[in-house]
């Protein structure tokens, strides 16, 4: 099943997020992803946990998953590079780099997103955009078109409260509010964009969605700049 959903959001403006990727398994949407270089998509490591025997591809330039669009193109994956410290049973280091079979054809609907290299927390209350093709309600309805939601960043101390994530949020992770509007499992791998800069990647740990006491968890890309650079080099 697809890993992820945007709850309480709305349909995104078509092709206004040219960095947005759909990571697909055997032709079906599995996870979100973000184009960070001409030939590289960043996603979440857990996305490929159950994909050992399947064909992984990356869809770029899409708004609708099913409808023909001039900018849409499906790329094969040459190489999948999960973070070496990612493990199935933790949310830590949940990053994955996918090398496309060739450089993406760039244009207005396909363009890499600048990512944050300054390793400093995003200020609480900052409004950040999350987008994805995950299911849009608790009944499991899957959208055909890209959805998004604007969420405020939550301070780590609040996120780590015993009633919330109970100390699980390390300095390499960040949180965003989840009060009825939220990202969730299958938007995993998708981007958290603050002011035009990629700050976080949706983690793919199992978590109740849309509950304000269980904020959304995102991997801070700035904390992994050295690893990203080493893989892309």
């Amino acid at each position: 099943p697809p890993r992820g959903r945007i709850l309480g959001g709305r349909e995104a403006e078509a092709h206004a997020r040219p960095y947005m990727a759909s990571v697909q398994l055997n032709g079906a949407h599995l996870c979100g992803g973000v184009l960070v270089a001409e030939q590289w998509v960043l996603s979440a490591a857990h996305c490929l946990e159950d994909a050992a025997d399947g064909k992984v591809q990356v869809l770029l330039g899409a708004h609708s998953l099913s409808q023909p669009e001039p900018s849409k193109r499906l790329y094969d994956v040459l190489r999948a590079v999960p973070h070496p410290d990612s493990q199935p049973d933790t949310i830590d280091h949940d990053l994955l780099l996918l090398q496309l079979s060739e450089k993406a054809t760039l244009g207005p609907a396909v363009r890499p997103l600048p990512w944050q290299r300054v390793d400093r927390d995003v200020a609480p209350g900052t409004l950040c955009d999350v987008a994805g093709w995950g299911i849009v309600n608790h009944a499991g309805r899957r959208p055909d078109s890209l959805q998004h939601v604007l969420l405020p960043v939550l301070d780590r101390a609040t996120c780590n409260r015993r009633t919330h994530h109970d100390g699980a949020i390390t300095e390499r992770l960040m949180c965003a509010e989840s009060n009825r509007r939220d990202s969730c499992k299958g938007d995993s791998g998708g981007p958290l964009v603050c002011g035009g800069v990629l700050e976080g990647v949706v983690t793919s740990g199992s978590r109740v969605c849309g509950n304000r006491k269980k904020p959304g968890i995102y991997t801070r890309v700035a904390s992994y700049a050295a690893w990203i650079d080493s893989v892309l080099a």
Epitope: G8, T126, D129, P152, R180
Partner: antibody, heavy 122, light 107 residues
């Protein structure tokens, strides 16, 4: 068309509280953040905080925590700001403004109320 | 907090002239900058968002530029309705802060 209509001027005594309203029309109220600003006579603008009517989520500038309380009434598409323990320093014009979305995560205050003047005097 | 330093504080100009107002952020704000015009006794009006994009209905004589920490608003062929105060404001993190303003008056 989008409009934010604020309540009229207020003359209040020191130590009292005042509640300012901002009635939205011409758009889906629960889809957009509402920000509040303060402007003292002849001065610049200060950001007080925001509220998201869809979830009642709020965030305050540290400087205004304990001074301002933001609420909404979804049924009337109205945002409110309660200012408490008023002093002469709170005499100002207060504005509400809608936060509009532009492209993927750029946003700006695209529509503003006309402002509400609050005068604190004994 | 991010400080926004706006200059000049005031400017006396004639109609038809070109003026440039600058705004310096105390750190990189990644083009998350808006410009507003405010007339006496009125509310601010959005002119420019994301540093360079004109808001709906804003005349093309207005233009925004800049990146990183340095931004500017340029008004060419100044019209009588352009007199008033101008403010920059950042959207990079919280709290949101405004510049102190630039008052444009008729020479």
């Amino acid at each position: 068309q989008v409009q934010l209509q604020q309540s009229g001027p207020e003359l209040v005594k020191p130590g009292a509280s005042v509640k300012i309203s901002c009635k939205a029309s011409g758009y889906t109220f629960t889809d957009y953040y509402i920000n509040w600003m303060k402007q003292r006579p002849g001065q610049g603008l200060e950001w007080i905080g925001w509220i998201f009517p869809g979830s009642d989520s709020t965030y305050y500038n540290e400087k205004f925590k304990g001074k301002a309380t933001l609420t909404v009434d979804k049924s009337s598409s109205t945002a409110y700001m309660l200012l408490s323990s008023l002093t002469s320093e709170d005499s100002a014009v207060y504005f509400c403004a809608r936060l509009g979305y532009y492209s993927h995560s750029y946003y700006a205050m695209d529509y503003w109320g006309q402002g509400t003047s609050v005068t604190v005097s004994s | 907090d991010i400080q926004m330093t706006q200059s000049p504080a005031s400017l006396s100009v004639s109609t038809g002239e070109t003026v440039t107002i600058t705004c310096r952020a105390s750190e990189n704000i990644y083009s998350n900058l808006a410009w507003f015009q405010q007339k006496q006794g009125k509310s601010p009006q959005l002119l420019v968002y994301a540093a360079t994009n004109l808001a709906d209905g804003v005349p093309s004589r207005f233009s925004g530029s800049g990146s990183g920490t340095q931004y500017s608003l340029k008004i060419t062929s100044l019209q009588s309705e352009d007199f008033g105060s101008y403010y920059c404001q950042h959207f990079w993190g919280t709290p949101l802060t405004f510049g102190a303003g630039t008052k444009l008056d008729l020479k």
